[in-house]
């Protein structure tokens, strides 16, 4: 029978002859050299050589365990002579024993971690890992040990497991951002002779917010012309915040001063300033500077920095308005005047009056726009406004004037301002009542006395304020006639009567009556009409049949007698 | 006075790409937020992408149609916005406008003459 | 993501009339985040009120916007021949969005 053990062999033999692996031997072997051994499998006859006499084993070659920690081979004792078998074929192993030849490996030749600036003491980082390709099972050469050879006093490194941890109290990202931390993984657990290998551990510090907005300055002055439309930014100012991204975003509100209502402030979303807005429309004339608090805050604070105080700081804004020439004002929207239609040329109405708004209280003149007063019936005072008239009037042609009246600053005629003027022309009792058309009548030569042929009415272009009352009489030449009279009704009609019994149309065919009508208006107007009246021929009804004398030669024919 | 001049539209096949470029003047460019903006032949508006300013990272952002295929890049040196298409689709098909946003970097103030993209077989 | 709609999403209106359009976001946002537009055909749309009531320069005194929270609106006093546009609205929260648009037309 075969008479060995496994074979051992230390690795990275670096001796100058064969290494000795072992020997081969058969019990059947009386050294006389009769029998023959023989070695195949894994590198035999090349790696692995055999004295086929004494069956001892050497290796030809430095061996690495890493690289193949066991090779397994067949042995075979032959009868030299006849070349059969004195032992079965028997397999075998020759195992590679381990030296520590190897040093740790990080798995990374460089890593990126980040931890957020101020974590407590402790907080993970990040575990980096080096692995050895000595034999784990057998010695220290591939047991691993951690330690940090920078990066101290910030970070720490667990000596098992790799992981790194911060080791220092309020590490602040504004102060120092970026670390970089060399680790050193040492195999023999870390022993005298130990190998050894180091990675580079890059460590950003990610933001907190644990910096509140700061203005840099206490106080900002801006100026905006009055005229400025609501909505105009007029000025920028910016806290500074050392924190970044979403922690360094800033709101802006005003939260106190006297342009609380006239001012905004809202926050450019892209370069975080605050920009003062107009809200409502100024008046330089009404208030020349405004203070306004701003309030700079952060919108996303960490309740655990709470303690360093608020995160918000203030500064005053000052704002100039600044003075815009504004045309001159008047005051009222539009005038309404009235005058006498009766008014002599150059009489007063009445006045209009403008300002300059301005602090400066520009003189002002007036003018009349002579586009709305063609006929140049009005005129005004340029200096103090004043109204009147340079033609005389007539309300009955004109009602009401309206005309533009512009006043302008004298000391710069840019500036100027229109307002309507309404004239009423007030009514004089200056026209006298007519008839209200042409009266032309008719009575039936068989007419009885008394009998009403015609009622008369009048019109007057006047408006006095209580009405129109009319009074009619006969003209004087006309009343004492004995044909006709006249009846005035008392309701600004009168009726034409007849004054006797049948009447002769060949005697006389027509007849033409005065009639005075007069109103009671002050000064009384009166004027006269005539009222013709034909004699006709009528049937049995008194509808008329013929008006025409059969000889209506003679001029004696036509009488105004009544 | 503010401009915006968009360039580089036309015709385009059903997966292809194209290239779209605003020349930006008339006011400080790297203070500004940039975006695109569509509108299909007798549609509505539609917000296309968004860059941001240098300080904001040039922080991108897009319409969930166009993300993956579109992105949106500036050039501050040249004061121009680009907008790169690919894998172009029909409904893509629209007149885009490069627009800036008012003060403050609100609202879409101001916008350019548009460009028609048309992606047709 | 923010929507917005608008409406009516068309109207008929004559001139000199006083002319309401709505906008209603599904969740509240900041008057300063709410903008409202006027575009006519073929034409780039125009600021017309920015940060819920401001006037965009330029932009006539008849128009106005007002509201918080979730409904803003835009107000046209008088209506003039070249309000005739369609206009939306449109908030600042990424993703941006705008309203459908609300066409307004002649009567």
């Known amino acids: 029978s075969w008479m060995w053990n496994q074979f051992f062999l230390l690795e990275e033999y670096t001796g100058s002859d064969y290494q000795y692996v072992g020997k081969l031997h058969s019990d059947q072997d009386r050294g006389d050299g009769s029998l023959k051994y023989i070695l195949s499998g894994d590198g035999a006859g090349d790696l692995f050589i055999i004295n086929e006499n004494t069956g001892d084993i050497q290796a030809t070659k430095r061996l690495d365990r890493e690289e193949k920690p066991v090779y397994i081979l067949r042995a075979q004792a032959v009868n030299r002579r006849t070349g059969r078998p004195v032992e079965p074929e028997s397999e075998f192993i020759i195992k590679i024993h381990d030296i520590n030849d190897n040093e740790p490996i990080f798995t990374k030749d460089v890593y990126t971690a980040t931890v957020p600036e101020m974590a407590d003491v402790g907080t993970f980082v990040v575990q980096v890992t080096a692995t050895d390709a000595d034999d784990p099972t057998y010695g220290n050469s591939a047991k691993v040990v951690y330690s940090i050879l920078q990066g101290q006093p910030y970070f720490s490194v667990e000596s098992e497991t790799g992981i790194i941890k911060t080791a220092l109290l309020n590490m602040d990202r504004e102060n120092r951002e970026q670390y970089q931390v060399v680790i050193q993984a040492k195999d023999m657990g870390g022993q005298m002779g130990g190998l050894s290998g180091t990675t580079t551990v890059n460590i950003t510090l990610t933001d907190v917010n644990d910096n509140p907005p700061r203005f840099p300055q206490s106080t900002y002055q801006f100026k905006t012309p009055e005229s400025s439309p609501p909505g105009t930014p007029i000025g920028r100012i910016k806290a500074s915040d050392a924190d970044v991204g979403e922690n360094a975003e800033i709101e802006y509100s005003i939260t106190d001063g006297e342009g609380h209502e006239m001012f905004d402030v809202i926050t450019d979303q892209e370069t975080q300033e605050g920009i003062i807005t107009v809200k409502k429309l100024l008046d330089f004339e009404k208030k020349k500077v405004y203070t306004l608090k701003v309030e700079a805050s952060n919108p996303h604070v960490e309740p655990r920095f709470l303690y360093l105080g608020p995160f918000k700081d203030s500064a005053t804004v000052r704002i100039v308005v600044d003075d815009v020439d504004e045309p001159p004002v008047f005051s009222k929207l539009a005038y309404i005047l009235q005058i006498r239609e009766d008014a002599r040329i150059n009489t007063t109405i009445g006045s209009v009056a403008a300002q300059d708004p301005d602090a400066a209280r520009n003189p002002v003149k007036y003018s009349v726009d002579r586009h709305t007063d063609m006929d140049r019936i009005f005129n005004i005072d340029s200096g103090n406004g004043s109204i009147f008239t340079s033609k005389l009037l007539d309300r009955e042609t004109l009602l009401w004037h309206n005309i533009t009246v512009i006043a302008t600053e004298i000391n710069n005629p840019k500036q100027s301002s229109r307002v309507p003027l309404y004239i009423k022309v007030l009514d004089v009792n200056d026209n006298a009542p007519e008839f209200a058309e042409f009266y032309e009548t008719f009575v039936c030569e068989k007419a009885k006395a008394d009998q009403l042929i015609q009622t008369l009415r009048a019109v007057d272009k006047d408006d006095p304020y209580s009405g129109h009352q009319f009074s009619f009489s006969l003209a004087p030449e006309a009343a004492s006639s004995s044909n006709f009279t006249i009846q005035d009704n008392k309701d600004n009609t009168a009726g034409i009567l007849t004054r006797k019994n049948g009447y002769n149309r060949h005697e006389m065919s027509t007849y033409l009556l005065p009639v005075v009508i007069s109103d009671n208006d002050y000064p009384v107007q009166s004027s006269t009409g005539t009222v013709t009246v034909r004699v006709c021929a009528c049937d049995h009804h008194g509808n008329m049949q013929s008006c025409h004398a059969e000889a209506l030669i003679h001029p004696t024919g036509l009488s105004t007698g009544a | 006075e503010v401009q915006l001049v968009e360039s580089g539209g036309g015709l385009v096949q059903p997966g292809g790409s194209l290239r779209l470029s605003c020349a930006a003047s008339g006011f400080t460019f790297t203070t500004y937020a940039m975006n695109w903006v569509r509108q299909a032949p007798g549609k509505g508006l539609e917000w296309v992408a968004r860059i941001r300013i240098k300080n904001n990272n040039y922080a991108t952002y897009y319409a969930d149609s166009v993300t993956d295929r579109f992105t949106i890049s500036r050039d501050d040196s040249k004061n121009s916005l680009y907008l790169q298409m690919n894998s172009l689709k029909t409904e893509d098909t629209a007149v885009y406008y490069c627009?800036?946003?008012?003060?403050?970097?609100?609202?879409?103030?101001?916008w350019g003459q548009g460009t028609l993209v048309t992606v047709s077989s | 993501d923010i929507q917005l709609t608008q409406s009516p999403s068309s109207l008929s209106a004559s001139v000199g009339d006083r002319v309401t359009i709505t906008c209603s976001a599904s969740?509240?946002?900041?008057?300063?985040?709410l903008h409202w537009y006027q575009q006519k055909p073929g034409k780039s749309p125009k600021l017309l009120i920015y940060?819920?009531?401001y006037l965009a320069s330029g932009v006539p005194s008849r128009f106005s916007g007002s509201g918080s929270g979730t409904d803003f609106t835009l107000t046209i006093s008088s209506l003039q021949p070249e309000d005739f546009a369609t206009y939306y609205c449109q908030q600042d929260i990424v993703p941006l969005t705008f309203g459908q648009g609300t066409k307004l037309e002649i009567k």
């Open positions: 627009v800036r946003p008012d003060y403050g970097n609100y609202g879409l103030a101001y």
């Open positions: 969740s509240s946002i900041s008057s300063h985040y």
């Open positions: 940060r819920s009531f």
